[in-house]
């Protein structure tokens, strides 16, 4: 399996009750506006064929996409949670900037691309869905990267 380097986050990032609560509240607010319950972004298909040691790199890719293509464009919605959660997630993204995989990451990019395609295909409702799954993103990052 490809070797991942610098794919680590300190546990303390996920032990801040206030921002954890705000992240979960933001996800819940968005999920209430999500009418498409047939599609799951962060689930079995995303992790398929990705070993445990590669998952932090996988989640870094998902985090970066979520920030750039979803949260920044939707930053005026779901206040006041959005204005607190986005900088927190951006800091995590910055801390993972040196997280790379040495070797072939095509299988990971394929899974991430499917997630991206799903969000794009659903349009704005795809973006809402991605925000509604921020709790899953948070917990997946936590388990994959600490």
């Amino acid at each position: 399996a490809p070797i991942s380097s610098h794919c680590r986050l300190d546990k303390s990032n996920f032990q801040q009750p206030y921002i954890t609560n705000r992240t979960f509240m933001l996800a819940k607010e968005a999920s209430l506006a999500d009418n498409n319950t047939d599609v799951r972004l962060i689930g079995e298909k995303l992790f398929h064929g990705v070993s445990m040691s590669e998952r932090c790199y996988l989640m870094k890719q998902v985090l970066n996409f979520t920030l750039e293509e979803v949260l920044f464009p939707q930053s005026d919605r779901f206040q006041p949670y959005m204005q607190e959660v986005v900088p927190f997630l951006a800091r995590l993204s910055n801390r993972l900037s040196t997280c790379h995989i040495e070797g072939d990451d095509l299988h990971i990019q394929r899974n991430v691309q499917k997630l991206k395609d799903t969000v794009k295909k659903l349009g704005e409702s795809g973006e809402i869905k991605a925000i509604g799954e921020l709790d899953l993103l948070f917990m997946s990052l936590r388990n994959a990267c600490i």
Partner: antibody, heavy 119, light 108 residues
């Protein structure tokens, strides 16, 4: 077919130790966390912790930290849960369960191992 | 003492609809899973993430959420549905899954 097959029932005296095994088949062992959950008539279900088969890393519930030990053997795709210093109230059915992400969506469970602690 | 509250028992006639609830404080932002446990058997996941159904679980099983209460609904109940049902959720603050005390479903 995904299967988790656990070791048989155990009867132990207070203060003794028990080691329960959980053999996985039908999927890639290293791709799923193995959790241990126990069930008692009084307390219901109680999460004990998980082992990451790929790395051997563990996460334990606070109650079991420094007490339980969870390990795995990749060569025979088996996870183990060892609990020393047994007390009467550790009498329970102990389950292993697999989960993809490391939190709480258990898509497959072992059949359970009854551990009875009695003098 | 369970953090998630479920009614101890629910009774329903065959062919009717059974509703099992699960509630808890500060629970509204967390996702809920439901497990079915028949006597002497291991639990089986029947609903995850509030309303998703794993493959192989009949469409008669559905889940929903409203505020601090999650609901498992079983329509056209059959005798084989008789079991204990448990809700669970992940608490990111204590970093562990929590379980309800269970509801015994009796098919009359």
């Amino acid at each position: 077919e995904v299967q988790l097959v656990q070791s048989g029932a155990e009867v132990k005296k207070p203060g003794a130790s028990v080691k329960v095994s959980c053999q996985a088949s039908g999927y890639t062992f290293s791709d799923y966390y193995i959790h241990w959950v126990r069930q008692t008539p009084g307390q219901g279900f109680e999460w004990m912790g998980w082992v990451n088969p790929d790395t051997g890393g563990t996460r334990y519930a606070q109650k079991f930290q420094g007490w339980v030990t969870m390990t795995r053997d990749m060569s025979n795709t088996t996870a183990y849960m060892e609990l020393p210093g047994l007390r009467d109230d550790d009498t329970a059915v102990y389950y292993c369960a697999r989960d993809l992400t490391g939190y709480d969506q258990y898509t497959a469970w072992g059949q359970g191992t009854l551990v009875t602690v009695s003098s | 003492q369970s953090v998630l509250t479920q009614p101890p028992s629910v009774s329903v006639a065959p062919g009717k609809t059974a509703t099992i609830t699960c509630g808890g404080n500060n629970f509204r932002n967390k996702r809920v899973h439901w497990y079915q446990q028949r006597p002497g058997q291991a639990p089986v996941l029947v609903i995850y993430y509030d309303s998703d159904r794993p493959s192989g679980i009949p469409e008669r099983f559905s889940g929903s959420r409203s505020g601090n209460t999650a609901t498992l609904t079983i329509s056209r109940v059959e005798a084989g549905d008789e079991a204990d049902f448990y809700c669970s959720t992940f608490d990111p603050f204590t970093d562990r899954p929590l379980f309800g005390g269970g509801t015994k479903l009796t098919v009359l």
